[in-house]
Structures are given as structure tokens and as C-alpha cells.
Interface confidence: low
């Protein structure tokens, strides 16, 4: 990026020294912030700059999942010589700025978590008007989402041979174990698939021959709890078919 | 120039809490995490937690919840911790840090105080 | 957590000699941190991101590795490097630190 070395309140300031703070920029974030899904979580980012007592237009941006190119969760503008960043994006209207941009800080608040939030995001600040001038955190803050197991799907499949399979599908951070009892299981890990492909949150345990009638139970659990389902297999004898 | 100037050895009782001080000076102390580190002999270094004095965010170590407490003062330029319920396990050295995150694609303790002993002894 | 083991703990050479220290890690880890603390001294940054070099540390160090190998070398040892050699990571909470590598000077 450009960065402009003439500033109207110095002679002539000179912004590749990075002998002190108020002569570089640089951004301040953790490398990691946890939260619960459910809760807030604060994603902290401070800055400095080489442009003293900038009070020109600037605009306050968050993306998520690369620094540079990953799509905007929150952008925020402010008017020359005002201290309100006016919102102009927050994506599902969760993302509320915390700091104040022209006090050089971009924190931002995350509202409602969801599992789906676990991601790096990167802050990044604009400034437009007599100086032009941009900086991006090139690591950001990776937000760590943690959940309690919830069980998404349960359900009974016809397999090959007049036979049924059980699947069982949860969601969690931690990723839950899972494990299946019934009628002649006792308590089966059965076989997992953790995590799925693509949905790193996502565990599938399958019990792949349900060979008698009766209540399959599903439990899932990691260290922020446990949750349970269960599914009813009640077969036809003579026929095909099965009540579920 | 950047130094972190912290508070004398105490000698405490076990059961009863302690507060160290961090003295920042040379730089804009709201811009940058302190971070403290215990030395235990024998134990290497851990982290126990850091604090931004801009935005007053803490990150802490799972296993000194409830045992120490960070604040800062930024009228001051001071950083402080408290830890509470002291046993002989926390008779250490104390070390503040200043903490630059984000700068030249790393994160490091560039800055440290000269430490604060504490001894826990009946 | 990640568990950080350095080894060895005490390493003993003469000036001159090339050594080794290395630090495994319980998890892949993206960079490795490195500081130097001397009997009676608060530890000091002397490596970062693996491989860069802090102010005023000389050239005679060097780090090396990725995933969850890691290790710093110094070429040509001196008197002065006698010390304890931490290293650390930041990838992921808590942040942690190896138990250190001891170097004396025979």
C-alpha cells in the first residue's frame, strides 16, 4: 500500500523510522479469544499509526477468514473530526463496535455465538482525506467457539438385507464423543466419524445393524456437558418395513 | 527508553493474598499487553495471564482462575497482580512483560521487569 | 495445553564448538519463540518466529524447524552465551514454555 510522507502538522514525517509507537503502524490483537456459543465474546485491537493527530474521514473495517481479501463482517465510518463511527455493515446485526477509532482502538463485540463464528478475524483501519493511508492486522484474532453437545440428527435407515442402521449426528466444541446404547448394546462407541469433512464441529456415529426391536439411545458429551436422543425401531415381523 | 519497573519481595503468610506492582515508562503503556510470568526453581517459566490497559481485556491462564488477578492503572502507567489464597506452591519469581502481538508478523515478551519475589512461609 | 520439552537440559561445550538445543512440541505449532536468561536476569527475547533474530543478538544464533520440531544453534560458542535458553509458543492457549536448556562453558 501507499503511505504518504507529508503530514500537515509535521514538516516532514518520515514513516518508514520504527524507533517509536507514534511513528509506525501496528496493530495489537491476540492470537486467541474464547468464548461460549450463546455468549458475547470482545475481540480486542488497538492500533498506532505515523500520522499525528489524524482527525480526517476514517473508516473501521472486520473481516473474517483472511486478512486483505476475507468478506467484511463490520464496517464502520467516521466523519472528519468525529468520534462516531457510524455502522454501515454488521453482518446479522451482531457485531458492535466497543472502542473508539479515533482513540486507536477498533475493538469490536461479537453478539449471540454460534458455532459457525469460529474463525480468525482481522481488523483494519482506512484513512481518507488529506492522508491517505491503510493497515490491516496480518495474524488477527482467532475467536474459539466451545459448546455444549447438541444432537442434530437421529434417525434409522434401511441398509442391504432387510436390515436397519442407526445414525447419530451432534455438534460441538470440544467435539462431543458419542456413544449408542439398546436392546443388547450395552454402551457401544459404534462406529464414529469425527469429525466430518468439511464441518469440523459435526461427530456421526453410526450403528450399522440394529438387530433387535426397541429404544436406541444417542449420547453426546464433551467437558461442557452432555445431551441425549433417542430413536424407537419397531419392526413388522413377516414384513419389510419398520416403525420408527 | 522502555523499562518495567516493579514492586519488591514480599514475605507472606500462606492464606492471605499479595499485590505486585509493574511500573511501565518509555512508551505509550495503553498501546501494548503486559503479560506475568511465574518462575518457580526447577519449574521453567508459565504464563499466567496478560492485559491490554487500553480496553481493560484480560487473557488468563486456565489454571491461575480464581488465584490471580490482573488490573491496570492507566493514569499511572502501572499494572498490577494480586493472588489470593497463597501457598508454598506460589513462593516464585514475578515477571511483568510487555507484550507486542502483531507487529513484523509475530508476537513477543520484547520487555521485561526485573521480577518480584514472593516467599509464602508460616 | 501444548507441552513444550527442550533437550537437552544441560549441555556443556567449549568455546568454539557448535551446539544444539531442541525443543519438541505435544502439537504442531506455527513459529517458535526463544529467550535467553542468565542467573539473576529476567529473561530476554532472543529468537523470534523461529528464525528471526532480536535486536543485538549475534549471528552466531540461528533457529530452525516447523511443526513440532524446533531447535536453536549456536555456531561458534563463546564464553558469554553460558545461560538458560527458553523457548515458547504462541499458537494456541495457554501459552506455554519448555523447561529450558542449560548451556555452561567448559
Known amino acids: 500500500f501507499v503511505r504518504t510522507k507529508i503530514d500537515t502538522t509535521e514538516n516532514l514525517l518520515n514513516t518508514e523510522v520504527h524507533s517509536s509507537p507514534a511513528q509506525r503502524w501496528s496493530m495489537q490483537v491476540p492470537p486467541e479469544v474464547s468464548a461460549e456459543a450463546g455468549d458475547a465474546a470482545v475481540l480486542p485491537c488497538t492500533f498506532t499509526h505515523p500520522h499525528r493527530h489524524y482527525d480526517g474521514p476514517l473508516t473501521a473495517i472486520w473481516r473474517a477468514g483472511e486478512p486483505y481479501a476475507g468478506p467484511q463482517v463490520f464496517r464502520c465510518a467516521a466523519a472528519r473530526g468525529s468520534e462516531l463511527c457510524q455502522t454501515a455493515l454488521s453482518l446479522h446485526g451482531r457485531f458492535r463496535l466497543l472502542g473508539n477509532p479515533r482513540r486507536n482502538d477498533l475493538s469490536l463485540r461479537v453478539e449471540r455465538l454460534a458455532l459457525a463464528d469460529d474463525r480468525r478475524y482481522f481488523c483494519r483501519v482506512e484513512f481518507a482525506g488529506d492522508v491517505h493511508d491503510r493497515y490491516e492486522s496480518r495474524h488477527g484474532v482467532r475467536l474459539h467457539v466451545t459448546a455444549a453437545p447438541r444432537i442434530v440428527n437421529i434417525s434409522v435407515l434401511p441398509s442391504p438385507a432387510h436390515a436397519f442402521r442407526a445414525l447419530c449426528t451432534a455438534e460441538g466444541e470440544p467435539p462431543p464423543a458419542l456413544a449408542w446404547s439398546g436392546p443388547a448394546l450395552g454402551n457401544s462407541l459404534a462406529a464414529v466419524r469425527s469429525p466430518r469433512e468439511g464441518h469440523g464441529h459435526l461427530v456421526t456415529a453410526e450403528l450399522p445393524a440394529l438387530t433387535h426391536d426397541g429404544r436406541y439411545t444417542c449420547t453426546a458429551a464433551n467437558s461442557l456437558g452432555r445431551s441425549e436422543a433417542s430413536v424407537y425401531l419397531f419392526r413388522f415381523h413377516g414384513a419389510s418395513g419398520a416403525s420408527t | 527508553q522502555v523499562q518495567l519497573q516493579q514492586s519488591g519481595a514480599e514475605l507472606v503468610r500462606p492464606g492471605t493474598s499479595v499485590q505486585m506492582s509493574c511500573k511501565a515508562a518509555?512508551?505509550?503503556?495503553?498501546?501494548?499487553?503486559i503479560g506475568w510470568v511465574k518462575q518457580r526453581p526447577g519449574h521453567g517459566l508459565e504464563w499466567v495471564g496478560d492485559?491490554?490497559?487500553?480496553?481493560?481485556?484480560?487473557n488468563n491462564n486456565e489454571k491461575f482462575r480464581g488465584k490471580a488477578t490482573l488490573t491496570a492503572d492507566t493514569s499511572s502507567s502501572t499494572a498490577y497482580m494480586q493472588l489470593r489464597g497463597l501457598t508454598s506452591d506460589d513462593s516464585a519469581i514475578y515477571y511483568c512483560?510487555?507484550?507486542?502481538?502483531?507487529?513484523?508478523?509475530?508476537?513477543?515478551?520484547?520487555?521485561w521487569g526485573q521480577g518480584t519475589s514472593v516467599t509464602v512461609s508460616s | 495445553q501444548i507441552i513444550l520439552s527442550q533437550s537437552p537440559a544441560l549441555l556443556s561445550a567449549s568455546p568454539g564448538e557448535k551446539v544444539t538445543m531442541t525443543c519438541r512440541a505435544s502439537s504442531s505449532v506455527s513459529y517458535m519463540y526463544w529467550y535467553q536468561q542468565k542467573p539473576g536476569s529476567s529473561p530476554k527475547p532472543w529468537i523470534y518466529?523461529?528464525?528471526n533474530l532480536t535486536s543485538g543478538v549475534p549471528a552466531r544464533f540461528s533457529g530452525s524447524g516447523s511443526g513440532t520440531s524446533y531447535s536453536l544453534t549456536i555456531s561458534r560458542v563463546e564464553a558469554e552465551d553460558a545461560a538458560t535458553y527458553f523457548c515458547?509458543?504462541?499458537?494456541?492457549?495457554?501459552?506455554?514454555f519448555g523447561g529450558g536448556s542449560r548451556l555452561e562453558i567448559r
Open positions: 518509555g512508551y505509550t503503556f495503553t498501546n501494548y499487553w
Open positions: 512483560a510487555r507484550v507486542d502481538y502483531d507487529y513484523d508478523g509475530s508476537y513477543i515478551m520484547d520487555y
Open positions: 518466529a523461529t528464525s
Open positions: 515458547q509458543q504462541w499458537n494456541s492457549k495457554p501459552w506455554t
Open positions: 492485559i491490554h490497559p487500553g480496553i481493560n481485556y484480560t
